[in-house]
């Protein structure tokens, strides 16, 4: 197993609709054909998996149907979008990239993107 550099933004603010997007870029040392991308969340001294997708270079990322993540790939960049976020989901979101094939196996872990989520204020009642 070999290490690989992964870059991601330090901070992202989710939209009022609870959507956050960020780019995860990895420095591929070779010509990988199969890549696995995992988004992890670190909060309260625990790391949990948010979503994961394996894709063939040149093809689209495919997350599970019930995943809160979507994404696209372009070269060594992955554009990730996480939906359905609420204030309680604020935390450090880490991009983990694995070059699965061909060997050797490479593992890269980003420094994390702090995603801030602010729940929208409910609209006040109107007389109209």
């Amino acid at each position: 197993c070999k290490a690989m550099h992964v870059a991601q933004p330090a901070v992202v603010l989710a939209s009022s609709r609870g959507i956050a997007s960020f780019v995860c870029e990895y420095a591929s040392p070779g010509k990988a054909t199969e890549v696995r991308v995992t988004v992890l969340r670190q909060a309260d001294s625990q790391v949990t998996e948010v979503c994961a997708a394996t894709y063939m270079m040149g093809n689209e990322l495919t997350f599970l149907d019930d995943s809160i993540c979507t994404g696209t790939s372009s070269g060594n960049q992955v554009n990730l979008t996480i939906q359905g976020l609420r204030a309680m989901d604020t935390g450090l979101y880490i991009c983990k990239v694995e070059l699965m094939y061909p060997p050797p196996y490479y593992l890269g872990i980003g420094n994390g993107t702090q995603i801030y989520v602010i729940d929208p204020e409910p609209c006040p009642d109107s007389d109209f």
Epitope: C1, S45, V47, T48, I109
Partner: nanobody
């Protein structure tokens, strides 16, 4: 809240083997840096081994190099310390310790640890 629990200690003859396990209750050890320490009677506590959050890095005290092996079993949420060719001087209480570092340090061992287990006794004697 995560708590660390060691198991696998016991009495073994010189040259024998033991397999210590460090498990987490109340959470997981995923990406935690885990260290193994021991304290022999009348001596200071010393770090024996550690494994990084990714499992890519392991460190060993000179006194156990080539005899002890630390590894992660993420499927069972445990960290294993395999101890072979045990000697009388390996006798002591073995403690599992852990710390969740920033992701930039997941490939490193921690310099200090937040959590400590209760310890498990290892006695090497004929």
């Amino acid at each position: 809240e995560v708590q660390l629990v060691e198991s696998g200690g016991g009495l073994v003859q010189p040259g024998g083997s033991l397999r210590l396990s460090c498990a987490a209750s109340g959470g997981t050890l995923d990406y935690w840096s885990i260290g193994w320490f021991r304290q022999a009677p009348g001596k200071e506590r010393e770090e024996v081994s550690c494994i990084s959050g990714t499992g890519l890095r392991t460190n060993y005290a000179d006194s156990v190099k080539g005899r002890f092996t630390v590894s992660r079993d993420n499927s069972k949420n445990t960290v294993i310390l395999q101890m072979n060719s045990l000697r009388a001087e390996d006798t002591g209480v073995y403690y599992c310790t852990g710390k969740l570092l920033h992701p930039s340090l997941w490939s490193a061992c921690a310099n200090e640890y937040d959590l400590w287990g209760q310890g498990t006794q290892v006695t090497v004697s004929s």
